[in-house]
Interface confidence: low
């Protein structure tokens, strides 16, 4: 993989770890929320980004060509950023400056930018069209989205931890 398209694995690892923490802070499983332990319906299950075995995010896949996996992660981050920008999170008091939600939003953007290859045009992707959610549905949707994001980020963080440990190029001393 050309040097220019290789991410700064250590920085990605640090940012993704921070993102995991922020996602949990934004939605720590509270006791009363457990009463709402709704089963993931088919539509939710199929329409959220999941890093799967065919995405090349396993150690061997990363070694062979990390770009395939990194593209999945980039698109997952864009997907969730799109959801956080949607009306589902509008009017959410937690979106006040420096709140966990606001920090999560900023960090998602930061990691996305870090993963965007410099020599690569910005990828365009069709995002899910969101029907205006009813006020009463929003807390439940927010909960589902954040739990799904937590799972996605946990895997992404493992990918970056592996990359930082095994794929970081040693610094070559200059003469």
């Amino acid at each position: 993989v050309p040097r220019s398209s290789s991410p700064d694995w250590a920085q990605c690892q640090q940012l993704s770890r921070n993102l995991c923490m922020l996602a949990w802070n934004a939605h720590a499983p509270a006791g009363h929320m457990n009463l709402l332990r709704e089963e993931e319906d088919e539509e939710t299950k199929n329409n959220v980004p999941r890093i799967q075995c065919e995405d090349g995010c396993d150690p061997q896949g990363l070694k062979d060509n990390s770009q395939f996996c990194l593209q999945r992660i980039r698109q997952g981050l864009a997907f969730y950023k799109h959801l956080l920008d949607s009306d589902i999170f509008k009017g959410e008091p937690a979106l006040l400056p420096d709140s966990p939600m606001e920090q999560l939003h900023t960090s998602l953007l930061g990691l996305s930018q870090l993963l965007q290859p410099e020599d690569h045009p910005r990828e365009t992707q069709q995002m899910p069209s969101l029907s205006s959610s009813q006020q009463w549905q929003r807390p439940l949707l927010r909960s589902k989205i954040l739990r799904s994001l937590q799972a996605f980020l946990a895997i992404a963080a493992r990918v970056f931890a592996h990359g930082a440990a095994t794929l970081t190029e040693p610094l070559v001393p200059t003469a």
């Epitope: 199929n46 060509n65 770009q67 999945r72 992707q125």
Partner: nanobody, 122 residues
Framework: EVQLVESGGGLVQAGGSLRLSCAAS????????MGWFRQTPGKEREFVAA????????YYANSVKGRFTTSRDNAKNTVYLQMNNLKPEDTAVYYC???????????????WGQGTQVTVSS
């Protein structure tokens, strides 16, 4: 209507080569990945390789790594699977499939071709 049409299958001697094509039509596939799968009677469909339309990133199953190469021609809306050093165990029906990149649920490939038979004789 979306259509994926595979071609290029056939009978080949062990050690030989074949190139499969998958012509895609009916929609824009810019945000899709194209996967190659294979299936032998009585066995589950097995992932072989995948390529992303947007940047050409590829990924291969361990069993074909170093022997198979997938590529795409955006102008022709076609993806290819170049199979070299074929072995008898590569005998199967080969399918191409398309999957939205923003949805990663496995194996939710939205569209499938009808398949093309590849037979490798020893």
């Amino acid at each position: 209507e979306v259509q994926l049409v595979e071609s290029g299958g056939g009978l080949v001697q062990a050690g030989g080569s074949l190139r499969l094509s998958c012509a895609a039509s009916g929609r824009s596939f810019s945000d899709y990945a194209m996967g190659w799968f294979r299936q032998t009677p009585g066995k589950e469909r097995e992932f072989v390789a995948a390529i992303s339309w947007s940047d050409g990133s590829t990924y291969y199953a361990n069993s074909v790594k170093g022997r198979f190469t997938t590529s795409r021609d955006n102008a022709k809306n076609t993806v290819y699977l170049q199979m070299n050093n074929l072995k008898p165990e590569d005998t199967a029906v080969y399918y191409c499939a398309a999957r939205r990149l923003v949805y990663y649920s496995d194996p939710k490939y939205d569209y499938w071709g009808q398949g093309t038979q590849v037979t490798v004789s020893s």
